[in-house]
C-alpha cells in the first residue's frame, strides 16, 4: 500500500508513457489518474514498468472498478495480468475470445498458473460449453489442457470440438477421461472412411470398448504397439488371438517385448497356449491344453 502524498509540481501524468518508468511508487500513486490509466491501458504493456510499479497501477484500477474490470480494460492488461489474483479474476466477465488470447499470450511458454486456470474457468462457464474455437485456442497455449479437466467437465465438450484435438493434447489423459472423450470422437469422425477414421480415432482408443476393437480388427488398421498398450485392459481381454493379430497386423511381433506388461500380460493369461503358439512369437503363460475355462462373470450375469 502506497501512502497518499501530493504529486510534485510538474509531474502530473498527461498520458501513459515511458517517462513514468522513472517515477517512484508514491509518485505513480500521486500523479497518475486512474481514469486516464483505464483509457490508455493499451499503452501499459509497451512500457517496461517494474512489477512493483504494476502493483501501484493495479491498485488504481481496483479503486476505479471495485466490482471488477470492464472487458475493455481486461483485454489490454498485458503483464499486469500476472499481478491479478484468482479472486480478482472471479469478478470479471470475459466473453471475447480475443481477450482470452491476449491474456494467455502473456503467460505463453509457462505452466498454467492459478490466474490462468481461473480465467479459463470463467470464460468457459460464461460460454456454457467448450466450443471448437475455444478448445483450439486453449490447446494451442496449453497442450495438456484437455487432460486437466474432470470427466464431468469433459462431458460438456460437444463432439464438433473434437476436431480441434491433436494427439499430443491427450498425452496426459487417464482412462476415465478417455472414456468420456472416445464416444464423442467416434461420433465426430463417423463419416470418415476406414483408414482416415483410424488415423483420427487412434489417440482416443484408450476409451474404446471391446466391440469397437473387434470391428477395427476387421479393417486392416495395423495398430502400433504404443496405441495397443494404452487400450483398456477390460476391453482387450475378450479379444481372441486371431483378432489381436488382425488388429496389430505387422506390429504383432511387438507383443513379445511387452509380454510382462499390461494389458498384454493379462490378455496372454486369458488365451489358450495353443492359440498363442500360432503367432510364433514364443509367448508363454497361456491356458494349457486340455484345461476348461469357466467364465464366472458370464455365469453370474445369467443367474
Amino acid at each position: 500500500e502506497v501512502e497518499k502524498t501530493a504529486c510534485p509540481s510538474g509531474k502530473k501524468a498527461r498520458e501513459i508513457d515511458e517517462s513514468l518508468i522513472f517515477y517512484k511508487k508514491w509518485e505513480l500513486e500521486a500523479c497518475v489518474d486512474a481514469a486516464l490509466l483505464a483509457t490508455q491501458m493499451d499503452r501499459v504493456n509497451a512500457i517496461p514498468f517494474t512489477y512493483e510499479q504494476l502493483d501501484v497501477l493495479k491498485h488504481k484500477l481496483d479503486e476505479l472498478y471495485p466490482q471488477g474490470y470492464p472487458e475493455s480494460v481486461i483485454q489490454h492488461l498485458g503483464y499486469l495480468f500476472l499481478k491479478m489474483s484468482p479472486e480478482d479474476i472471479r469478478k470479471w466477465n470475459v466473453t471475447s475470445l480475443e481477450t482470452l488470447k491476449a491474456l494467455l499470450e502473456v503467460n505463453k511458454g509457462h505452466e498454467m498458473s492459478p490466474q490462468v486456470a481461473t480465467l479459463i474457468d470463467r470464460f468457459v462457464k460464461g460460454r456454457g460449453q467448450l466450443d471448437k474455437d475455444t478448445l483450439d485456442t486453449l490447446t494451442a497455449f496449453y497442450p495438456g489442457y484437455l487432460c486437466s479437466l474432470s470427466p464431468e467437465e469433459l462431458s460438456s465438450v460437444p463432439p464438433s470440438s473434437i476436431w480441434a484435438v491433436r494427439p499430443q493434447d491427450l498425452d496426459t489423459c487417464d482412462p476415465r477421461q478417455l472414456d468420456v472423450l472416445y464416444p464423442k470422437a467416434r461420433l465426430a469422425f463417423q463419416n470418415m472412411n476406414g483408414s482416415e477414421y483410424f488415423v483420427k480415432i487412434q489417440s482416443f482408443l484408450g476409451g474404446a470398448p471391446t466391440e469397437d476393437l473387434k470391428a477395427l480388427s476387421q479393417q486392416n488398421v495395423s495398430m502400433d504397439l504404443a496405441t495397443f498398450m494404452k487400450l483398456r485392459t477390460d476391453a482387450v481381454l475378450p479379444l481372441t488371438v486371431a483378432e489381436v493379430q488382425k488388429l496389430l497386423g505387422p506390429h504383432v511381433e511387438g507383443l513379445k517385448a511387452e509380454e510382462r506388461h499390461r494389458p498384454v500380460r493379462d490378455w496372454i493369461l486369458r488365451q489358450r497356449q495353443d492359440d498363442l503358439d500360432t503367432l510364433g512369437l514364443g509367448l508363454q503363460g497361456g491356458i494349457p491344453n486340455g484345461y476348461l475355462v469357466l467364465d464366472l462373470s458370464m455365469q453370474e450375469a445369467l443367474s
Epitope: Y51, K83, V106, G109
Partner: nanobody, 116 residues
Amino acid sequence: QVQLVESGGGVVQPGGSLRLSCAASGSTFSIRAMRWYRQAPGKERELVAVIYGSSTYYADAVKGRFTISRDNSKNTLYLQMNSLRAEDTAVYYCNADTIGTARDYWGQGTLVTVSS
C-alpha cells in the same frame, strides 16, 4: 530462478569510461526486461537505464553518456558509461524480471568510483 552477477566496476577519473557487465544464468528465456539501477552513498536506489525487447530507456541524468545493451547469445547485459562525473559514483545493480513468475531478480552490485 535467474542469477545475476555484475562485473566491471572500479575507480576512474572524471571524463573517463567504464563498461559494466551483468551475466545472467538460470531461466533466462523468461526474462522480460533488464535494468541498471544505482545507489549513491546515503541516497535512494535510482533507475538508470532499461532494455525491453529492442527498446532502451535512460534517466535524464545519464542520457547521451550511458548506453545499455544486451547480448542474448551470451546472456549478458552491458552498461557502457562515458564522460563519467563525480556524481555517477555509486554501487550499480543489475536487475531482471521474469514472465510467468512475475518476479524481480537482483545482482550483488558493483562499485563505481569517479574521482581524481
